[in-house]
């Protein structure tokens, strides 16, 4: 499903290519902004975001941000241009097809972020790189 408030033009006229010359088409990403989450102490979680969006620009990638403080845990899912910082951090892993979470230094909270470039790749956020996607027992996340 593509929600109208985030669905943007799929621009076939202004061609954007990657470093190999392949056309970069607008990507499909989970796009729920910030939601409360119970994803904690797991190797992997599903976003449980029901909104799949076509990103506004072909160069945008999927991003997920997991934050934990004394009060709650949140998961943010968006599209974002990797040329621009997000939450003051560069998206170093934007070319990855999977969303491998990396911890970032943020005072007062635990902060993980990942970015990736395959359709809806921020639906499955991976905290352990050796995680095997075929194990369904690791895919539990409930939103409040």
């Amino acid at each position: 499903t593509i929600p109208p408030h985030v669905q943007k033009s799929v621009n076939n006229d202004m061609i954007v290519t990657d470093n190999n010359g392949a056309v970069k088409f607008p990507q499909l990403c989970k796009f729920c902004d910030v939601r409360f989450s119970t994803c904690d102490n797991q190797k992997s979680c599903m976003s449980n975001c029901s909104i799949t969006s076509i990103c506004e620009k072909p160069q945008e990638v999927c991003v997920a941000v997991w934050r934990k403080n004394d009060e709650n845990i949140t998961l943010e899912t968006v599209c974002h241009d990797p040329k621009l910082p997000y939450h003051d951090f560069i998206l170093e892993d934007a070319a990855s097809p999977k969303c491998i979470m990396k911890e970032k230094k943020k005072p007062g909270e635990t902060f993980f972020m990942c970015s990736c470039s395959s359709d809806e790749c921020n639906d499955n956020i991976i905290f352990s790189e050796e995680y095997n996607t075929s194990n369904p027992d690791l895919l539990l996340v409930i939103f409040q």
């Epitope: 799929v10 088409f25 395959s118 359709d119 809806e120 996607t133």
Partner: antibody, heavy 116, light 107 residues
Framework: QVQLVESGGGLVEPGGSLRLSCAAS????????MSWVRQAPGKGLEWVGR??????????DFAAPVKGRFTISRDDSKNTLYLQMNSLKTEDTAVYYC???????WGQGTLVTVSS | DIQMTQSPSSLSASVGDRVTITCRAS??????LNWYQQKPGKAPKLLIY???SLQSGVPSRFSGSGSGTDFTLTISSLQPEDFATYYC?????????FGQGTKVEIK
């Protein structure tokens, strides 16, 4: 330039099988959800099914009329999408289009005729 | 599945005419509605997405409106290249279903 080229269409008898292929180029195929849409002669468009990326498990969805008879697969190493059609019926006669799911890229279509 | 019903199924019009095609969904689909144009022997081309947003490269004489269950595609001044078949499609839920099409013919 994005290119989607379907092949494998032809004449088949009712109850028979056929496998369509879609060769993709010009984009990172492995990163994309892909769909099949069909159009019976002189009729409208009908979504057949989709396959998600291998990275997310390669899950598939199908329209009710083809569920259990058609399967969709992909070979990311060959940049190729497949539609395996079994137990074909005369009402499956159509031009089958390969599409980049939910985006405006379509192949030229390949005609499948189911007839005795 | 959500059923999409277009009307009329065909219409005859002249160059310069204002043309309106309607699409009704069997249940509310918010604004998750796309319009396609198809010419004989060709693949469909996306014109309007999210009910009212114009796809890049599509002439501004095409416009879309509506939300919920009732939607409209309008061609403000029909041009020779606009004679084609038009389809609505909902992208609210899987399967993403199409209307049966509206053929716009030369009067």
């Amino acid at each position: 330039q994005v290119q989607l080229v379907e092949s494998g269409g032809g004449l088949v008898e009712p109850g028979g099988s056929l496998r369509l292929s879609c060769a993709a180029s010009g984009f990172t195929f492995s990163n994309a959800w892909m769909s099949w849409v069909r159009q019976a002669p002189g009729k409208g468009l009908e979504w057949v099914g989709r396959i998600k990326t291998t990275y997310s498990g390669g899950a598939t969805d199908f329209a009710a009329p083809v569920k259990g008879r058609f399967t969709i697969s992909r070979d990311d190493s060959k940049n190729t999408l497949y539609l395996q059609m079994n137990s074909l019926k005369t009402e499956d006669t159509a031009v089958y289009y390969c599409t980049l799911d939910l985006r405006d890229y379509w192949g030229q279509g390949t005609l499948v005729t189911v007839s005795s | 599945d959500i059923q999409m019903t277009q009307s009329p199924s065909s219409l005859s019009a002249s160059v310069g005419d204002r043309v309106t095609i309607t699409c009704r969904a069997s249940q509310s689909i918010s604004s998750y509605l796309n319009w396609y144009q198809q010419k004989p022997g060709k693949a469909p081309k996306l014109l309007i997405y999210a009910a009212s947003s114009l796809q890049s490269g599509v002439p501004s004489r095409f416009s879309g409106s509506g939300s919920g269950t009732d939607f409209t595609l309008t061609i403000s001044s029909l041009q020779p290249e606009d004679f084609a078949t038009y389809y609505c499609q909902q992208s609210y839920s899987t399967p993403p279903t199409f209307g049966q099409g509206t053929k716009v013919e030369i009067k």
